[in-house]
């Protein structure tokens, strides 16, 4: 029972994890302008993997989407592959994980390969909560070394009393998002690896074994007649899984600017 | 056809308060802002503030806080500015404008003469 | 507050010249996020509400004519009236549009001869 109640769970806990990767991936705040130096402004940016917008204070947003593949920093390429390799990691683990629930009867389907099922789904939450984790946490990176370098110019003098306020971008909600979908997608595979270890059936094997009497070339197998002492070995086997999932994706160099719409 | 339809000349004795109403038709009220300018004695303009009709948010300009007070009325696709404790500089034209693209002032009443005098 | 300075404050001219006003702000109203200037110019008739007829420093609203150019950038930025028209008689504005409080230059004071 609590085997289910822990795959259950961690298959619940990881569809909220691989839905808020999913959401945060779509979203427009990745990074927001900072208010800090300019609360004043009539004018809101903010930017996402995918596009760039701007929000008018008369309510009118503008989005623009980065038409060019080429032409973007290598690390946002770096945060959109890894947050497309989590989201079908995790999508993929999901479709496992649907046939690997102990409270879904599909066909003579055996408990062992259930837990086969469950550990590979697990291994590929596990997978794809990091890679969440990862690429959220490389563009959050990515945002304070911008906004140090950019606070480094903040002000760039246009001789006399003009000033031009270079715009400085903040963490958005997406990255909160992301963080907190990483890791429930990762507690969730944890959760399905360990109700995949009381998935496993237990085999009680009976090894043959030769008694010798003095005397006698009797040979007497256990739970026979004559020979009913327990010496057979009870040996619980358990299978030994292989979890060597890897991903290599490439650390890239910084951009030189964030701004890259 | 879009319209900003604003209350009458008002005279009133300092001191006093004042509602100015901004009458709307023809757009959604509620998906524009709507802004207050004065004019004073045919010189240059001067916004108030505005409001925004669907949450009913101010953002005011710091020098007219605590003058004026804007509120809209859904129902009736109404915007008003309330001014208190009138003086002599508050005599001036009062104009309601909408907001458009680029937060530029797209619609505009025709304006209501304000004149505060003893 | 952003501060707008209309240059000349009044200019008299004959029908059919070119005229060109300038207003300058005291900080940028360009906008890096969609590389747009928050600058919009007004026309006012003597006796009427104002007339937007430029956004985004460029941008000419609808049914305004094509006569009316409104171009610069950053801190710096030009109204032109390719030819002038004796209904062009009036004040023209210019508004920051990027920053709270939205502040006004004097005006252009277009007088006609």
């Known amino acids: 029972m609590a085997v289910t109640a822990c795959q259950g769970l961690g298959f619940v806990v990881s569809l909220i994890g691989i839905a808020g990767i999913i959401a945060a991936t779509c979203m427009d705040q990745w990074s927001t302008q900072d208010l800090y130096n300019n609360p004043v402004t009539a004018v809101f940016n903010y930017q996402g993997l995918w596009r760039s917008c701007v929000r008018e204070s008369s309510g009118f947003t503008e989005c623009r989407g980065y038409f060019t593949l080429l032409g973007l920093p290598a690390m946002l390429q770096a945060v959109r592959a890894l947050m497309i390799v989590g989201i079908v990691l995790g999508a993929i683990g999901l479709l496992v994980s649907i046939f690997a629930l102990k409270c879904i009867r599909i066909g003579s389907m055996e408990d062992s390969a259930k837990a086969n099922m469950t550990l590979t789904s697990g291994i590929m939450f596990i997978v794809s909560g990091l890679c969440a984790i990862a690429g959220v946490s490389v563009f959050a990176n990515m945002l304070v070394t911008n906004f140090w370098m950019s606070t480094a110019n903040m002000y760039t003098g246009m001789g006399g009393m003009v000033q031009t306020v270079q715009t400085r971008y903040t963490f958005g909600a997406a990255l909160f998002v992301g963080w907190v979908a990483g890791g429930l997608t990762l507690i969730g595979g944890v959760m399905m690896c360990i109700a995949c270890r009381g998935l496993a059936p237990e085999e009680t094997n009976y090894k043959a074994v030769s008694y010798h009497a003095s005397g006698h070339s009797v040979a007497y197998k256990p739970g026979g007649f004559k020979a009913s002492t327990g010496f057979g070995s009870n040996t619980k086997n358990k299978k030994i899984y292989d979890g060597g999932a890897r991903t290599e994706d490439e650390v890239q160099s910084y951009p030189s600017k964030h701004d890259y719409v | 056809e879009f319209q900003l339809q604003q209350s009458g000349p008002e005279l009133e004795k300092p001191g006093a308060s004042v509602r100015i109403s901004c009458k709307t038709s023809g757009y959604s009220f509620t998906g524009y802002n709507m802004n207050w300018v004065k004019q004073s004695n045919g010189e240059s303009l001067e916004w108030i503030g505005n409001i925004d009709p669907y949450y009913g948010a101010t953002r005011y300009n710091q020098k007219f806080k605590g003058k004026a007070t804007l509120t809209v009325d859904k129902s009736s696709s109404t915007a008003y500015m309330q001014l208190k404790s009138l003086t002599s500089e508050d005599s001036a034209v009062y104009y309601c404008?909408?907001?458009?693209?680029?937060?530029?002032?797209?619609?505009w009443g025709q304006g209501t003469t304000l004149t505060v005098s003893s | 507050d952003i501060v707008m300075t209309q240059s000349p404050s009044s200019l008299t001219v004959t029908a059919g010249e070119k005229v060109t006003m300038s207003c300058k702000s005291s900080?940028?109203?360009?906008?890096?996020?969609?590389?747009?200037?928050?600058l919009t110019w007004y026309q006012q008739k003597p006796g009427q509400p104002p007339k937007l007829l430029i956004y985004?420093?460029?941008t000419r609203e609808s049914g305004v004519p094509d006569r009316f150019t409104g171009s610069g950038s950053g801190t710096d930025f030009t109204l032109t009236i390719s030819s002038v028209q004796a209904e062009d008689l009036a004040v023209y504005y210019c508004?920051?549009?990027?920053?709270?409080?939205?502040?006004f230059g004097s005006g252009t004071k277009l007088e006609i001869k």
């Open positions: 508004q920051n549009d990027y920053s709270f409080p939205f502040t």
């Open positions: 985004w420093a460029s």
């Open positions: 404008a909408r907001s458009y693209y680029g937060n530029a002032f797209d619609y």
């Open positions: 900080q940028s109203l360009l906008n890096s996020g969609n590389q747009k200037n928050y």
